[in-house]
Amino acid sequence: QPQGLSGMQGEPSLGDSSSGEDELGVDVLPSEEDAPEEADPPDGEDPPEVNSEDRMEESLGLEDLSTPEAPEHSQGSHGDEKGGGHSHWSYGGTLLWPQVSPACAGRFQSPVDIRLERTAFCRTLQPLELLGYELQPLPELSLSNNGHTVQLTLPPGLKMALGPGQEYRALQLHLHWGTSDHPGSEHTVNGHRFPAEIHVVHLSTAFSELHEALGRPGGLAVLAAFLQESPEENSAYEQLLSHLEEISEEGSKIEIPGLDVSALLPSDLSRYYRYEGSLTTPPCSQGVIWTVFNETVKLSAKQLHTLSVSLWGPRDSRLQLNFRATQPLNGRTIEASFPAAEDSSPEPVHVNSCFTAGD
């Protein structure tokens, strides 16, 4: 029986999982580089928004080493060659993102650190329902390197329900990763960063198109899963990873056979974390419903290596470490569809619970 994110002591270890996924736990203090910079103040407020990663970049001047693009302030002109708008952004200049889009300075941003002991068990969070995610090889799908990530554009017909009356359709999926020796997930769990993370972006069926939904509560929903190393190759991911060489250049786009998108996600869709946040790249629009699965997806070391070294970004630099630092919760509660807080300490003082109207 694989253990959950909430249940294990010590570093995450790999258990047997016939489905190709695993559940993890991270209860010990995370490694220093990923540890939260400071504990939350006594009144429960979150620490200041400047985080350890930005501090490290600024104080040590590591932007050029640790990002797929040199920071904007070293590029001469921050904006376009012709236009005065600040449209260029990079992972090396995240503190400048609010100049690209003011929403990036919002109070309810993503990603976040999921502190298990602070999650609220919410019995009303039901298993997710996915419909039409098992795509046939034809029609083919667009796979692109947009300079920030690898993106698979999804066709109409992939439907997902967060709950009764909360229906969405999938738009695209993309990945976030690190380097061969540095993890690159966007969300963290108790400060622990995973090797990589997949995001499947969905649009609420209440909106006919994306720009109506941006910034509206529940307008967009993202399903997120952590990718973790295991001895076995993941055949579903190989259908994506085998094409990365063909889109190694920034701006490349190819057509690949359709695949089973649900196979890229964990098999257990019932245990997850839920909170309201934002897009993790500009325009950083808020109101996004995040679902972060407890079960991880397992890829081989070779596959994770392929992901981290195959793509190139601007100025002939590798596309790596394409994750945003975790953002303060600012009073938000992360809900869990299972008692994660209960499992995370041997003798919980109390179990946070979720309250909905009418409870």
Partner: nanobody, 117 residues
Amino acid sequence: EVQLLESGGGLVQPGGSRRLSCAASGNSVNIFSFAAVAWYRQAPGKQRELVAVITTTGGTKYSDSVKGRFTISRDSSKNTVYLQMNSLRAEDTAVYYCNADYLQDYWGQGTQVTVSS
């Protein structure tokens, strides 16, 4: 509703030049600031082919058939992307489409470019 509107097409002589424009309208967010924008073309009886792409970082990529002749650029303050086409050839005759790829695909209606003497 986001709309992409191409303009600048028409009849041009071989060896001549033309500049196509793609303007975005109807969106609350400047889509060209956050989307990779591409020009595609489709000649009669042929499949649509990717001509040029400009990413949000300003990176550009061109198909082999237009490399050195075409230049893609953007002016985010005007929410417009351009395709400067020089040394035009008869085989460049096609309908040219603008495509913005940010979370979902947006397409224009296309503009006809005919290269003929």
